[in-house]
Interface confidence: low
Amino acid sequence: HNTTVFQGVAGQSLQVSCPYDSMKHWGRRKAWCRQLGEKGPCQRVVSTHNLWLLSFLRRWNGSTAITDDTLGGTLTITLRNLQPHDAGLYQCQSLHGSEADTLRKVLVEVLADPLDHRDAGDLWFPGESESFEDAHVEHSISRSLLEGEIPFPPTS
């Protein structure tokens, strides 16, 4: 799996979207988990409604919400009041029995508050480039692809 980068501004909300094949994952609940260490487990943060038919209902755990458009095939996670400690590597998962398939690996970046009505995208600085081998930057705020590695985020 490639890693998709979502960038948010501290104190604001960030929406993460995870598209999937609605037929392949029909009837499956979904979850959002945080990766603990490069080889460590993915710790569940929040999962969709226990009844799959009610997956469209938003469920919260603290400042994190999850909702699933099972027909359109899009899982949406909202991180409210984003804080620096929210930065890190996450996964969107599709659950079946005790197993979980990874729908998308997500790197959440938290950038400084855009004071003085600056464009939020300006706080994200690296320029655009032609290639980004192991990651894709999702346009949750204005910015573009960049080249280089994504080191594994610190877990502390």
Epitope: L107, A112, G127
Partner: antibody, heavy 118, light 112 residues
């Protein structure tokens, strides 16, 4: 007033390494704003070395510096670091840390002079 | 890499004069997000550079309004309407639309 304080001048012999530091006195912004390192060589102008986002240690290097420089950051002391290895006379320069804002190198440290000489 | 070409290399002026510095990039600096990340800096002898203008035409905080930036695409200009003694130094442009970020060679503003 933004204040980035860099470590003092360094004299090194060829083949050795050096680690420069840059303390940011804005502890709230430091973890979540990109820090960039730039060097200035007389007659060669400015060269961008790389960026780091301290909160998650995300690093982006200029191709020229991928094997030369290592960027690091400590969010406890609000300090960014630049380590340069396998030094040659070509690495003699003033090295600046800068903090990003407005899509630009908005705030600059005072610079650290690195001299590589046998 | 994007090459930033600055002209002139040296600009002798009298105090109170208008001064113009040109910066040309080897490719368009319009970012995918619609912004143009072209900056102007001033470096005085023995000092760090200071940001004057960001995103082509926006003055950074504390920068006097005698400084103005203009241009688009690949051609950009910094103007100083009435040069004062404190304006003397080396001006350089920089782009941060494309990796790696690159810089112009500098223009030395000096007294005629």
């Amino acid at each position: 007033q933004v204040h980035l304080q860099q470590s003092g001048s360094e004299l090194r012999s060829p083949g050795s390494s050096v680690k420069l530091s840059c303390k940011d006195f804005d502890s709230e912004v430091f973890p979540i704003a990109y820090m960039s390192w730039v060097r200035q060589k007389p007659g060669h102008g400015f060269e961008w070395i790389g960026d780091i986002l301290p909160s998650i240690g995300r690093r982006i290097y200029g191709v020229k510096f991928e094997d030369k420089a290592t960027l690091d950051a400590d969010t406890v002391s609000n300090t960014a670091y630049l380590e340069l290895n396998s030094l040659t006379s070509e690495d003699s320069a003033i090295y600046y840390c800068t903090r990003k804002d407005y899509g630009s190198l908005a705030y600059w440290g005072q610079g650290t002079l690195v001299t590589v000489s046998a | 890499d994007v090459v930033m070409t600055q002209t002139p290399l040296s600009l002798p002026v009298s105090l109170g004069d208008q001064a113009s510095i040109s910066c040309r990039s080897s490719q368009s600096l319009v970012h995918i997000n619609g912004n143009t990340y072209l900056q102007w800096y001033l470096q005085k002898p023995g000092q760090s550079p200071k940001l004057l203008i960001y995103k082509v035409s926006n003055r950074f905080s504390g920068v006097p309004d005698r400084f103005s930036g203009s241009g688009s695409g690949t051609d950009f200009t910094l103007r100083i309407s009435r040069v004062e003694a404190e304006d003397l130094g080396v001006y350089f442009c920089s782009q941060s639309t494309h990796l790696p970020y690159t810089f112009g060679g500098g223009t030395k503003l000096e007294i005629k």
